[in-house]
Interface confidence: low
């Protein structure tokens, strides 16, 4: 029998250029008579143009919704009712070709053509894009608050904030023809629920979304987004009602930046430079294509690419890469944003060099990508360390911490977290190395103690990049480095000349002069430690709630012992900057560290002094007794302590702690406490210091109170942020 043909709605969006009309400001106001009259004429022209082609039989509806410069650009959408089987045949490209063909056929025609009665349409200026009913609905919902802005070359235009009576607004942005638009979004409130979406076209087409941001992001307080060309749309959706705009938007046209480079690398190891997407740290644009050609001086070397919070992964099947596509020596890889460092190592087999291509495969983009490049020795990629194949990084081997996700850095170790004697491969405790007492059979633990040695897991690296064998040589009163750098920056870690923590005892004034109390409106929230004249270190999770993210809320007290009273030795500071570790992850507690810059430098006294920071190679031996301090609760669920409490805890081997916490303990964590429980940190101690005393009498910061199951529970140790795991970031910020 006869079966009715199934018809489907196909939606198209687009723009066309009119050569015999000029744009005027009146056309930006939808309520103006100029807009109404121009819309009516343009709508008529659009319908006549479509119905003049073989698309006419499918014509359903159309709308011209906006105008722009160029001399006059009309922005429109239309719907065709198409038989289901023809759906794929009438792609936007085909529809555009049909309409252009129609326009070209009448360019020199003297015959009366309805759609040319008023308008001279430029065939080259016609653009047709795929859209959906949902896109049109989204567009229509913004038309009550629709702003068109043209921004000229060299201009930076600050956009007028949204109309708070509307629930959604759209800024339609246009710039000069051969430039690209760069939009800057700055969140100005600590908390909001507003949503902003940026599109690479004039309207909210889901398939051309560049990015969407939501709710006053602390991770990205400023976002810069690049369009692929001179047109862009920004859609705002209201969050909570507010009389203050929670953001500032500004836009400027910028020139296309070439993203191609030829480089020849020097004959040396380590980082030699940086490659980045155009206008880094701006988001890369939807049609970014970068091609970097690097020539390596010799086949002894491989090329290393060091990424920050971005990794490359093999993409199975031919799915598009959603966070950037890379091709390196004909291998296709997909970028992936991660909260970890990552390195891609490229073996070099020919002197022709290596070409690296980066492409944004879809319109959805993300933060600009930056990569440090350099060489590594192909025969020994990680001298003295272990090459972690999972992430391409060099990690310490056999130090008792599984730095590599697959744990291979701790496999096949003859001596784990100990020194291996040359003579018979016996293992001795690290503090016994270079202590003047031979412990190995033939005294190999006391050899080469006065000279440079190859760098390894437990060697200390001097400023001149040479290494010394003696473990933990910092600030012990004896110069071990040729350049004396192990004895620099040693005005730290000494207690004052003075004579809560669960299971603790009250501290005296000046006993822990680095201890900080971080307060909000006069209430102690977290602990911290002074590490430099203007810097206090604490835990990132103290700022987890949006309401705690603003620097203006916080006051830092140093030299304090009692919460309910002041004494002459204590001082207070406001916070000028708050920096959370860029890899901090709330759920896993990984990289749980933050730095607070004080509004003025501290004046050192008996009661206020910094603690010493360990080198990356500093070894805090499991079993060592260290101390934690703070005003936290004296029992689980209890109120905070009035007096600064102190308690000794024992450092726990990583694998034991990892087992207890079901393998949630990362290499940036350190465990301390007792199998029996009792002595532990508790609520309110977060961010406070775990310090260990060196043989020199100086105290070194080993950890920060981070997390744990309850307080002082049997078998559940306290988990601390491992300072040696985040020291490079701390040094980078503080210096």
């Amino acid at each position: 029998g006869y079966k009715a043909e199934v018809m489907v709605s196909q939606v198209y969006s687009g723009s066309l250029r009119v050569l015999n009309r000029h744009f005027s400001q009146d056309l930006t106001r939808r309520e103006s008579s100029a807009f109404r009259s121009e819309t009516a004429k343009a709508q008529k022209m659009l319908k006549e143009l479509i119905t003049s082609t073989r698309l006419g039989t499918y014509y359903n509806s159309s709308s011209v919704y906006s105008f722009g410069e160029g001399p006059l650009t009309c922005f429109f959408w239309f719907i065709l009712q198409i038989p289901e089987h023809r759906r794929l045949m009438l792609s936007p490209e085909v529809v555009q070709a049909l309409l252009v063909e129609e326009l070209l056929s009448t360019v020199n025609s003297s015959a009366a053509v309805p759609y040319r009665a008023e308008y001279e349409v430029d065939p080259e200026g016609l653009v047709i894009l795929e859209a959906s009913v949902k896109d049109i609905a989204a567009l229509n919902s913004t038309l009550g608050c629709y702003r068109y802005s043209y921004v000229g070359q060299g201009q930076v235009l600050r956009l007028k904030g949204p109309d708070h009576l509307a629930s959604s607004c759209l800024w339609h942005l246009q710039g000069p023809k051969d430039l690209m638009l760069k939009l800057r979004l700055e969140w100005t409130l600590a908390e909001c629920r507003d949503r902003l979406a940026m599109y690479d076209v004039a309207g909210p087409l889901e398939k051309r979304l560049i990015t969407s941001v939501y709710g006053c992001s602390r991770q990205e307080p400023v976002v810069e987004v690049l369009a692929s060309g001179a047109i862009m749309a920004v859609v705002w959706k209201k969050g909570l009602h507010s009389y203050y705009d929670p953001f500032v938007l500004s836009v400027q046209p910028v020139v296309f930046q070439a993203c191609e480079v030829n480089l020849t690398l020097d004959n040396r190891l380590d980082s030699q430079g940086v490659l980045s997407t155009p206008y880094f740290p701006s988001y890369y644009s939807p049609q970014t294509h970068c091609s970097w050609h690097l020539t390596v001086p010799s086949l002894d070397y491989g090329l290393a690419l060091w990424f920050d919070a971005y990794a490359l992964r093999r993409q199975k099947y031919d799915l598009p890469c959603t966070q950037g596509q890379w091709t390196i020596q004909n291998r296709r890889l997909c970028g992936l944003r991660i909260l970890q460092p990552y390195a891609e190592r490229i073996p070099v087999v020919a002197t022709a060099g290596i070409t690296i291509n980066f492409t944004s495969q879809i319109s959805l983009t993300g933060p600009g990508v930056r990569v440090h490049y350099g060489l590594y020795n192909q025969s020994d990629p990680c001298p003295g360390e272990f090459l972690c194949s999972v992430n391409g990084l060099c990690v310490p081997a056999c130090d008792g911490v599984k730095d590599c996700p697959n744990g291979l850095d701790e496999r096949n170790c003859v001596c784990r977290a100990t020194f291996q004697c040359k003579e018979d491969s016996t293992c001795i405790s690290l503090p016994k190395v270079c202590d003047g007492q031979p412990d190995c059979l033939n005294g190999s633990d006391e050899e080469q103690c006065q000279e440079g040695v190859p760098c390894g897991t437990f060697t200390f690296q001097c400023e001149d990049r040479s290494c010394v064998k003696k473990p933990n040589p910092q600030c012990d009163g004896r110069p071990d480095c040729r350049d004396g750098s192990d004895e620099e920056h040693c005005d730290c870690g000494l207690q004052g000349p003075s004579s809560r923590i669960v299971g603790g005892a009250v501290s005296s004034e000046g006993e822990w002069p680095w201890q900080a109390s971080l307060q909000v409106r006069g209430r102690h929230i977290c602990g911290g430690a002074l590490i430099a004249d203007r810097w206090v270190i604490t835990a990132a999770h103290c700022f987890q709630e949006d309401s705690m993210a603003s620097t203006v809320l916080w006051t830092v007290f140093l030299g304090k012992v009692w919460q309910n009273s002041r004494w002459p030795g204590e001082v207070s500071f406001k916070v000028s900057r708050l920096l959370l570790h860029p890899y901090h992850e709330e759920d896993s507690h990984d990289y749980d560290v933050a730095l607070l810059q004080l509004d003025h430098p501290v004046v050192r006294s008996a009661a206020v002094r910094p603690v010493c920071l360990p080198a990356r190679s500093h070894f805090f031996e499991p079993g060592l007794h260290c101390w934690i301090t703070g005003w936290g609760a004296l029992r689980e669920g209890g109120p905070i302590s009035n007096a600064l409490q102190k308690v000794d805890v024992q450092l726990i081997p990583q694998d034991l702690c990892s087992e207890v916490y079901r393998y949630q303990v990362t290499p940036r964590m350190l465990c301390a406490g007792y199998r029996k429980g009792k002595k532990d940190a508790c609520q309110g101690d977060s961010g406070g210091p775990l310090v260990c005393k060196a043989l020199s009498g100086r105290w070194f910061l080993a950890g920060l109170v981070s997390w744990g199951l309850g307080c002082g529970r049997p078998n559940y140790f306290g988990v601390y942020t491992r300072i040696t795991g985040v020291i490079s970031w701390i040094q980078q910020v503080v210096t």
Epitope: K134, A137, Y317, L319, D587
Partner: antibody
Framework: EVQLQQSGAELVKPGASVKLSCTAS????????IHWVKERTEQGLEWIGR????????TYAPQFQGKATIIPDTSSNTAYMQLSSLTSEDAAVYYC???????????WGQGTSVTVSS | DIVMTQSHKFMSTSVGDRVSITCKAS??????VAWYQQKPGQSPKILIY???TRHTGVPDRFTGSISGTTYILTISSVQAEDLALYYC?????????FGGGTKLEIK
Amino acid sequence: EVQLQQSGAELVKPGASVKLSCTASGFNIEDYYIHWVKERTEQGLEWIGRIDPEDGETTYAPQFQGKATIIPDTSSNTAYMQLSSLTSEDAAVYYCARSIYLDPMDYWGQGTSVTVSS
Amino acid sequence: DIVMTQSHKFMSTSVGDRVSITCKASQDVTTAVAWYQQKPGQSPKILIYWATTRHTGVPDRFTGSISGTTYILTISSVQAEDLALYYCQQHYSTPYTFGGGTKLEIK
């Protein structure tokens, strides 16, 4: 409180049709997708399809195309699923559930049991 | 269609044990995988979505992780009330598909 309340159990004859309802409270169905899922003993869960009540746009799993029809009634905050030409293979518990954007189904109805018997 | 394979129909465990339920996707679904718990006579309840994100109110003994195209639901210390049927589901592309389910039983 978010809830999806489904209609009661149905006993239907082979070849007949049945219309199941799913009424939402605590949220507006226009802001979500509404899905339907089939559960048969020993067969596990099968996704039937979903509707965007805002514009009526539906997506079905190929094996339910022509078998299931999902319709919204935004005025009563209810979604319906009609099953046609019922056979013993259609005897199952049917759940409605909601999701937002690309997220999976976060709240489910209590299920409606459909028995097909002559 | 994307096939989600839960290789174990049944898993025996004891209270206090750590248990991992796996689910393999026939193609890459990035992180778009959810885990549901279903107890007899009840509707499924969501535990994990986007492979690793715990749904509000779900106890933290439930964690989701990924290894290649294998998705893992781990219960760190099984409680009596965790005995149920567990399903994975990909929410990457329609038609959405579920795994065959894994029934957690007491030894």
